[in-house]
Amino acid sequence: AGVFELQIHSFGPGPGPGAPRSPCSARLPCRLFFRVCLKPGLSEEAAESPCALGAALSARGPVYTEQPGAPAPDLPLPDGLLQVPFRDAWPGTFSFIIETWREELGDQIGGPAWSLLARVAGRRRLAAGGPWARDIQRAGAWELRFSYRARCEPPAVGTACTRLCRPRSAPSRCGPGLRPCAPLEDECEAPLVCRAGCSPEHGFCEQPGECRCLEGWTGPLCTVPVSTSSCLSPRGPSSATTGCLVPGPGPCDGNPCANGGSCSETPRSFECTCPRGFYGLRCEVSGVTCADGPCFNGGLCVGGADPDSAYICHCPPGFQGSNCEKRVDRCSLQPCRNGGLCLDLGHALRCRCRAGFAGPRCEHDLDDCAGRACANGGTCVEGGGAHRCSCALGFGGRDCRERADPCAARPCAHGGRCYAHFSGLVCACAPGYMGARCEFPVHPDGASALPAAPPGLRPGDPQRYL
């Protein structure tokens, strides 16, 4: 057993540009408090998963009111350490979440409102009994400076608080089979301490905190006798019946404690030790209120202070769930139409629209030809969010403003010469070729492939392409 201790040194704007706005104002004075959540191992569990090693809430800090025009300074902090007691061995590796909460002290009729200002998280290795470890963590524009340590509660010692020490009974040496307790050489390792309440007559342990039963006894504390009943011998019906051991039902069998409560037997019945936020004989009553800081990701808690009061979390954009614990992938709903690109900025959703579309969700199809005249008698053609001009003969370019050179593409085949003409182009064919583009040989196999040239046009004369 032992205690994890956290000392907050400062909470304020981090270095660099973009200093955060003060969380408090003259209209809404506020004060800070902190919540720490510890989990064993180097887990990357979600923020809302249970704080299996324990959690603690600080006292409220002094009331703070922003000075108009002044940048947010380091904010006044609550006094004292945050202490998280642990019952079992210290795991050596742990994950932490430290949340900075703001309590608004305006004239809310329903009591103060709480909101999460910043959350930092990390994974660390730490031996119990070591010196304070210092840390700096950043959350957005905020910076949190803190120290932490784990220390064992006597009589436990060691890096995991599993070895137990007792003052020496004799001045010179420890009892049989027990070693001196480094670094406390004047103390001796004590015999193992079994689970609290473990029957001294019917239970024993090989590890601290366990309770193993001698034959004939059962239950978590080895206090329940295994019932002896008559039962048939497997040798057959003619044999005499022999006594056999059948485990008797213990009051904690099947764990009657709800919501993660732990059951311990009492002489008459059982008792549930409930986790924070639950109470009642079987931990069946939820007593979570806004004071427990149940809303994650900057959610604002609404509710009264009475344990019977309900609470709801008013979630910021991009989060949902009863505690704002789930991030919403709002782009998965494909809100941007007409092929727009979706951007989830956290505080808002943006659509980057393709050319020719506009609107918050790219829902407006722009009239591509509106206000886009095509020059020189060209006509505008809409298509796929862009416009193009179909140009009159002799003109080209995006808006038909360029006078086209019809000969630029070398349209005349077989060495024909191209002449620009007011109505298009004319090809003067090389000897032996004819056609609008000089594409036909005059005598393909010695005979003309075409009818005789029309009157007034000899083969080889320029052919006008109409």
Epitope: A113, I312, C313, H314, P316, F319, G321
Partner: nanobody, 115 residues
């Protein structure tokens, strides 16, 4: 200033039912968290039932299974259906709405449960 207006309170016998309404009001929109608080004489004001802006509902332990909160966004109205009423439900019931910037309250409606 825009106010929320409750209706539907009154006197009822134990085991009876009442339906409280709040609105219509342009305050009661889907982007707001809304709820019903109650305050008995000499007691704190506590949230009986609420619906968050993301649609999660929650109830005080003492009313679970007996009260139902609902909202009609088309009519901008909030409701609280109360059944199996008990003497300890006697209180002034307040309609409430909030966003990140502001919170809004009704003036309250009295619910009295007595034989």
């Amino acid at each position: 200033e825009v106010q929320l207006v409750e209706s539907g309170g009154g006197e009822v016998q134990p085991g009876g039912s009442l339906r409280l309404s709040c609105g219509p009001s342009e305050i009661i929109t889907s982007d707001k968290s809304v709820g019903w608080y109650r305050q008995a004489p000499g007691k704190q004001r506590n949230l009986v039932a609420g619906i968050s802006n993301v649609g999660s509902t929650n109830y005080a332990q003492s009313v679970k299974g007996r009260f139902t909160i609902s909202r009609d966004n088309a009519k901008n109205t909030l409701y609280l259906q109360m059944s199996s009423l008990r003497a300890e439900d006697t209180a002034v019931y307040y309609c409430y709405a909030r966003d990140f910037e502001n919170e809004y309250w009704g003036q309250g409606t009295l619910v009295t449960v007595k034989p």
